[in-house]
Amino acid sequence: SEVEYRAEVGQNAYLPCFYTPAAPGNLVPVCWGKGACPAFECGNVVLRTDERDVNYWTSRYWLNGDFRKGDVSLTIENVTLADSGIYCCRIQIPGIMNDEKFNLKLVIKPAKVTPAPTRQRDFTAAFPRMLTTRGHGPAETQTLGSLPDINLTQISTLANELRDSRLANDLRDSGATIRIG
């Protein structure tokens, strides 16, 4: 079930999505798309970053935060009822089936007569993810030094989303362990 965010017609909508680069400049490609996250990539891409910069965007969609620090939250300017729906934030960690994907539901309400705040953040506390690695069995020679050194912080209101997240599974598959703190 998607986390729900609300905005009013004519205002700006804010959809949170974060990760924490292991070091400044160690960015991960990110895409935002309209519609639920497909198996790979983003459908109907509205904005995309690469390892250095925002390399694709469409009008009214922009990143207001510091994406170089992992704040890839999407701002949609001057929303209309047509902007309602599911949006996909995909943190494209290199590797097979390694992406972290979040579906966020945007609900647009008709404008009230009285002015409302320009941004509403309907989310609760962040869950930082601390990643620690352990060795493989004797049959494995490749070390986890090749894993992208990324700590992700998911903004979520549902603890089970954290437990079932893609990154958690894939890091576990890789021989890494995750401590949620």
Epitope: P21, A22, G25, N26, L27, V28, P29, A39, F40, E41, E51, R52, Q92, I93, P94, G95, I96, M97, N98, G137, A139, E140, Q142, L144, S146, L147, P148, D149, D164, R166, N169, D170, R172, D173, S174, G175
Partner: antibody
Amino acid sequence: QVQLQQSGGGLVQPGGSLRLSCAASGFTLSSYAMSWVRQAPGKGLEWVSGISGSGGSTYNADSVKGRFTISRDNSKNTLFLQMNSLRAEDTAVYYCAKIFGSYYFDYWGQGTLVTVSS
Amino acid sequence: EIVMTQSPDSLAVSLGERATINCKSSQSVLYSSNNKNYLAWYQQKPGQPPKLLIYWTSTRESGVPNRFSGSGSGTDFTLTISSLQAEDVAVYYCQQYYSGPPTFGQGTKVEIK
């Protein structure tokens, strides 16, 4: 030593179903992501489906989406591919493959031939 | 998805001679944060499953003879067999594991001239 023993291939009519199995030994299946890769006669390799170690996340190629389901029984150390609504173009040798980390395929099963024909 | 293109499709080389296979990706598979190219090479002999030869562009899998080497970065990669042996007759595939579904090149068949 790591081994992947496959079974379940055969001849099936278009629209039919088949279930492939891949029994793993020499490692703990639940610790690794796994995939199915196929190879049509005389052709190259095509990734079909993948699953996380926990089994909580699955991915499929567009060509099999909605028809093939990858699953695993970690207690039996076995990987499965349920293939429904089979088409002639699904005819191929199917390989199960262990994914090292989230990266390359370091071990492969021996392959099992699936023939879809009337 | 990333498209992988190999050249040539087939290659005939005399025993003891050098064989070179090229692989080109439709977009870069270099992740600048760890300076790694997410590319592997596999060898497939007739009637057998593929066998991992090289990963991270140039790291040989355990047990692979050192006559096999990989090089390249970004979008252009090369597998070299420095001195072709009879047992090297096979089809060779490159594969990217950088993003999207993992994709393979169409394969290069290496034969003895």
